[in-house]
Structures are given as structure tokens and as C-alpha cells.
């Protein structure tokens, strides 16, 4: 049994880091493998993560962690029974993938304006709370070419757009994701999408 692709890990900078790797053949990850992880500080002890299968030869492990600080560094040991398959380290602050925003809502009751709001996925005492910016993706269910991205570079989790920038009488979907420039994070996963019917009063043409 060998590791084909070494574990790569990302942290949500809150309480979970996710490590993924591939074995050289079909593996029952939860019964055959264990990932041990230990914070490199005095009196810290190793914790055990039981991996799950992620495709035939792929494994994924969700490591429980404390609130992350930039000094945190973990040793990682991947074991198959008594055999050490791989040894590495992981600094969560250098591999951050934010949590996905939630509760995306489209408010259509403001005259001729669409207000999209969502929730910041972090509590106010987390460092990332005040450092997230967002991308909002809006697309038409009827027309695959009608696909747009709005970058939200301010802190408020909301976006206002004129309803007239979208076609009237058509159903649209929206989703949002986040990233934090300060930690050069990857983008979060997209939030669940929300759907609405876009309708607005066409202005009378002046002749």
C-alpha cells in the first residue's frame, strides 16, 4: 500500500481543516488508514482522524482544530496499521479556504432594484470576519450565455443591482462565494443558489 498523491490540506480558519490524498489502488480509507495530527507546542498530543473514501483510491479527512492563529503548525502522520506511509506538516494559516457564505436572499420588493443579501460565515471574533470579500454569480436558467459575476470588494454582505440590468420575465439564479486577500486564500465553495423571477416595469420609450 502506497500513497500516490500526498495529502494536501486546507483550513477554514475556524475549527476544521480538510486533507485529501490518493492511494495507489482502491482503499477502504476508514478501516485501513489513520491520519494523526499534532499541534507543535509543549504538552500538545496527537489526535486521530478517521478518513472517509473520496472516490475509489481517494481519501479525505476532516481535522478538528481550535481557532487558528498564524503561529500554528501541525505535524501529520499517515498510518496504515503499524506502517508509516507518509509524514508531513501543515500550517493552517498558509492554506486557507474560507467557509461558504450562507442564507443568500434576493429581495425584489425594492422598486426596480434587486437587493441580494447573505451571511458572513464567520463569527465577529474570528479574524476573517472583517476580511472577506465576495463574488456573486447570477445566471439565467433559460439562457446559458446570460451569466455574470459581480465582485463585492466592500465588507457588507450585500449587493444592489438595477433589475433592468437583467431581462424581465425570466427566472434567474444567484450564488455567492468568499475569499480573503490578507491570507491569499483560495475561494470558498459557492453558497447554495437561490432562484427568483425577474420582473420590472419597462420604461416607456420616448418618440
Amino acid at each position: 500500500m502506497k500513497v500516490l498523491q500526498e495529502p494536501t490540506c486546507v483550513s477554514d480558519y475556524m475549527s476544521i481543516s480538510t486533507c485529501e490524498w490518493k492511494m495507489n489502488g482502491p482503499t477502504n480509507c476508514s478501516t485501513e488508514l489513520r491520519l494523526l495530527y499534532q499541534l507543535v507546542f509543549l504538552l500538545s498530543e496527537a489526535h486521530t482522524c478517521i478518513p472517509e473514501n473520496n472516490g475509489g483510491a481517494g481519501c479525505v479527512c476532516h481535522l478538528l482544530m481550535d481557532d487558528v492563529v498564524s503561529a500554528d503548525n501541525y505535524t501529520l502522520d499517515l498510518w496504515a496499521g503499524q506502517q508509516l506511509l507518509w509524514k508531513g506538516s501543515f500550517k493552517p494559516s498558509e492554506h486557507v479556504k474560507p467557509r461558504a457564505p450562507g442564507n443568500l436572499t434576493v429581495h425584489t420588493n425594492v422598486s426596480d432594484t434587486l437587493l441580494l443579501t447573505w451571511s458572513n460565515p464567520y463569527p465577529p471574533d474570528n479574524y476573517l470576519y472583517n476580511h472577506l470579500t465576495y463574488a456573486v454569480n447570477i445566471w439565467s436558467e433559460n439562457d446559458p450565455a446570460d451569466f455574470r459575476i459581480y465582485n463585492v470588494t466592500y465588507l457588507e454582505p450585500s449587493l444592489r443591482i438595477a433589475a433592468s440590468t437583467l431581462k424581465s420575465g425570466i427566472s434567474y439564479r444567484a450564488r455567492v462565494r468568499a475569499w480573503a486577500q490578507c491570507y491569499n486564500t483560495t475561494w470558498s465553495e459557492w453558497s447554495p443558489s437561490t432562484k427568483w423571477h425577474n420582473s420590472y416595469r419597462e420604461p416607456f420609450e420616448q418618440h
Epitope: V40, F41, E45, D72
Partner: antibody, heavy 117, light 112 residues
Framework: EVQLVESGGGLVQPGGSLRLSCAAS????????VSWVRQAPGKGLEWVSA????????YYADSFKGRFTISRDNSKNTLYLQLNSLRAEDTAVYYC????????WGWGQGTLVTVSS | DIVMTQSPLSLPVTPGEPASISCKSS???????????LDWYLQKPGQSPQLLIY???FRAKGVPDRFSGSGSGTDFTLKISRVEAEDVGIYYC?????????FGGGTKVEIK
């Protein structure tokens, strides 16, 4: 919210014994090392002993080895310190504290041990 | 054992003025990743100690930004930029480099 509540302190005669307890809540107790730290009246802080999260590793300051014993019951979320052969100079407030990143990220309110005849 | 030496023993301060406490260790607390294994704690009158600064310079959650930690190796400083009445108490440094964990003797900060 991390909560640590010590109990078991009291008045004991020199040469006597006492068992201190520390009830933990608000966090996954078994994931953390915990320590006992004491403070004699009007004096500074003195580290006594620590125990790893699983209970398998224990650590003591030299002056307490052989007289004090640290233990934990993770099923009860409780830390213990058995004090034997007590002396007048062991009179102190005994605190339990949760470890993280080497230091103490959460303290109990303390329990007073008085050794006197 | 690592010996921690704090100065001054007592520090009378005026509210609004800065204050500084020194802590020296008998051996280096700097580790390979560039972090110093030193914490600062405050024990307010009648209370348990509370963590202020960890790893030499990182403020613990909820600690006002008027508190800052600096230094490296064997010489460390805790600074309060503008002392407030609620800052009175005894300040301790502690090394987390090895067991036994050792504290400085404490610095009592009181209002003039």
C-alpha cells in the same frame, strides 16, 4: 465558553492528605492537556503539574514529585490532584488551567488548601 | 530549569500614561519557526489570572489593543500604551518552552 471549577480544598493537618477536583465544561476535555498551578498567600504563581489529554503523560515540578499525583477521568470531564504528606508551606490557592499552545487558555476560580495544626 | 526574572517589582502608574514591564529568561525562548515561547498573564485583585499575550507578541481574544508584547530570545517587554484603572493587578510572564513551566515573580501595577 470554557469553564473550570475546582473543589476539594479545606483545612488539613500537617502530614495529611487531600484530593482536589476540577470539573471542566464548555470544551472537549479529552483534547486538552490541563495543569495545576498554585499561589501561596501574597506570593506569585507556581506551576505544580500537568497531564496530557489522554492521561497517558504526566509532568511535575521537581518539588512535588512523589508527594502529589495528577490524574484525570475524561468520561467525567474531571481533573484531580492527590496531595499527600502535606506541609504548612503547601498552603495555597490551587488553580486548574487548560493548556493550548503551551500556555494557559482558561483558569478556574481556585480552591484554598490550608495546612495547619 | 528556566529562570524568569521580572522588573520592576512594583509599578505605580498614572491613568492615561504608558507603562512597561520587563521579563528576562535564563535561556532563549525563541524556537525554530521564529516564535517565542513566552506568555503574559494579568491577575486582577481577587481574581484568577487571565491570558493577555501568547507567543511573545500575540494578543489573546478580547484583550484591548493598548496591550502589546515584544522582544525575542531572552529579553521581553509588556507595554500598556495608556493605562486605565481596570489594568491594576499583578502581571506575570511565563515560559512555555519546556517543563517545568516557570513564572516570573510578578509586577504589581497600581494607580499613583
Amino acid at each position: 465558553e470554557v469553564q473550570l471549577v475546582e473543589s476539594g480544598g479545606g483545612l488539613v493537618q500537617p502530614g495529611g492528605s487531600l484530593r482536589l477536583s476540577c470539573a471542566a465544561s464548555g470544551f472537549t476535555f479529552s483534547r486538552y492537556a490541563v495543569s495545576w498551578v498554585r499561589q501561596a498567600p501574597g506570593k506569585g504563581l507556581e506551576w505544580v503539574s500537568a497531564i496530557g489529554g489522554s492521561g497517558g503523560r504526566t509532568y511535575y515540578a521537581d518539588s512535588f514529585k512523589g508527594r502529589f499525583t495528577i490524574s484525570r477521568d475524561n468520561s467525567k470531564n474531571t481533573l484531580y490532584l492527590q496531595l499527600n504528606s502535606l506541609r504548612a508551606e503547601d498552603t495555597a490557592v490551587y488553580y486548574c488551567a487548560r493548556h493550548l499552545r503551551g500556555g494557559f487558555w482558561g483558569w478556574g476560580q481556585g480552591t484554598l488548601v490550608t495546612v495547619s495544626s | 530549569d528556566i529562570v524568569m526574572t521580572q522588573s520592576p517589582l512594583s509599578l505605580p502608574v498614572t491613568p492615561g500614561e504608558p507603562a512597561s514591564i520587563s521579563c528576562k529568561s535564563s535561556q532563549s525562548l525563541l524556537e525554530g519557526q521564529g516564535y517565542n515561547r513566552l506568555d503574559w498573564y494579568l491577575q486582577k485583585p481577587g481574581q484568577s489570572p487571565q491570558l493577555l499575550i501568547y507567543l511573545g507578541s500575540f494578543r489573546a481574544k478580547g484583550v484591548p489593543d493598548r496591550f502589546s508584547g515584544s522582544g525575542s530570545g531572552t529579553d521581553f517587554t509588556l507595554k500598556i500604551s495608556r493605562v486605565e484603572a481596570e489594568d491594576v493587578g499583578i502581571y506575570y510572564c511565563m515560559q512555555t518552552s519546556e517543563t517545568p513551566l516557570t513564572f516570573g515573580g510578578g509586577t504589581k501595577v497600581e494607580i499613583k
